[in-house]
């Protein structure tokens, strides 16, 4: 059974995602943005299901397209360079999902904009933060 | 001194177009971003579209999206805001805004704005 | 769309008194750069909206030194320190950390 302090790692974890992929969406998803039209051309895959920390699995496959997308942007928008701030990303989801089980990523038919695949997982950490408050 | 000056509002029927225009002085107006934002009677300001400097990119939102067009002839210091297909909630005020993209201050100077009534 | 909500939505002051509007945004307004887009606007009765703070804490020229800005990621005040009887009006938040969005607005009025 998790422990309080576990939960409260967790917790941290998921906060530090979802400020991470927060901080993406804010750098893309703005009017000021040189590459938006072409970012949105680019398709991501979406989990059909992501409900459980497991499920993160969907989001570690899909890191490295993320990755490339984010390298169109200009380096004056970014703070980070996008590889390392997947880098950090990956971090955190391996130590969320764990690696003792190995799950199979089942995703939607229908593939996402750069905006809405982030918007999907940001949601996600939103309500798993909230199971565990 | 910066100014901006709206025209072009009026009253129309639903399903009509109307065309805004924003007039801009005392700054180079080519090099700055231009926004449209409304505000019904008695409400609050929704963003509605905005233009690159040079007219590169456009964006809108959603609401109007496929109706409204936003455009600027920099040549004459000119923002418009072309409305087809008009319905009761577009009834609003329409104000244009100066956003300097690249200085850490948006929405810097509105103008007056013109009153669009949409009614049969 | 990120979502900002003002609070409260009206607010009467005494002429000298200060006040407080809070302003909560739906997410982070954290950008990749650090840099934080919130602002404020004030609009008069009968007037178009007037810029009076950027980025969180910045006064736009000419904004007297009254007008003050606070907060970080989602929650931000305006303070006036000494309120007078030009403030009235509608005060607004603003985000431009993505496509811009305002919030409903807050009423200042004098009791």
């Known amino acids: 059974a998790p422990t309080s302090s576990s939960t409260k790692k967790t917790q941290l974890q998921l906060e530090h995602l979802l400020l991470d992929l927060q901080m993406i969406l804010n750098g893309i998803n703005n009017y000021k943005n040189p590459k938006l039209t072409r970012m949105l051309t680019f398709k991501f895959y979406m989990p059909k299901k992501a409900t459980e920390l497991k499920h993160l699995q969907c989001l570690e496959e899909e890191l490295k397209p993320l990755e490339e997308v984010l390298n169109l942007a200009q380096s004056k928008n970014f703070h980070l360079r996008p590889r390392d701030l997947i880098s950090n990303i990956n971090v955190i989801v391996l130590e969320l999902k764990g690696s003792e089980t190995t799950f199979m990523c089942e995703y939607a038919d229908e593939t996402a904009t750069i905006v809405e695949f982030l918007n999907r997982w940001i949601t996600f950490c939103q309500s798993i933060i909230s199971t565990l408050t | 001194q910066v100014q901006l000056v709206e025209s072009g509002g009026g009253v129309v029927q639903p399903g009509r177009s109307l065309r805004l225009s924003c007039a801009a002085s005392g700054f180079t107006f080519s090099s700055f971003g231009m926004h449209w934002v409304r505000q019904a009677p008695g409400k609050g300001l929704e963003w509605v579209a905005v233009i690159w400097f040079d007219g590169s990119n456009k964006y809108y939102v959603d609401s109007v999206k496929g109706r409204f067009t936003i455009s600027r002839d920099n040549s004459k210091n000119t923002l418009y805001l072309q409305m087809n297909s008009l319905r009761a909630e577009d009834t609003a005020v329409y104000y244009c805004?100066?956003?300097?993209?690249?200085?850490?201050?948006?929405?810097?100077?509105w103008g007056q704005g013109t009153l669009v009534t949409v009614s049969s | 769309d990120i979502v900002m909500t003002q609070t409260p939505l009206s607010s009467p002051v005494t002429l000298g008194q200060p006040a407080s509007i809070s302003c909560r945004s739906s997410?982070?307004?954290?950008?990749?750069?650090?840099?934080?887009?919130l602002s404020w606007l004030q609009q008069r009765p009968g007037q178009p909206p007037r810029l009076l703070i950027y980025k969180i804490s910045n006064r736009f020229s000419g904004v007297p030194d009254r007008f003050s800005g606070s907060g970080a990621g989602t929650d931000f005040t305006l303070k006036i320190s000494r309120v007078e009887a030009e403030d009235v009006g509608v005060y607004y938040c603003m985000q431009t950390t993505q496509f811009p969005t305002f919030g409903q607005g807050t009423r200042l009025e004098i009791k």
């Open positions: 805004a100066r956003d300097d993209f690249w200085s850490d201050y948006p929405f810097d100077y």
């Open positions: 997410q982070s307004l954290v950008n990749i750069d650090g840099s934080t887009h």
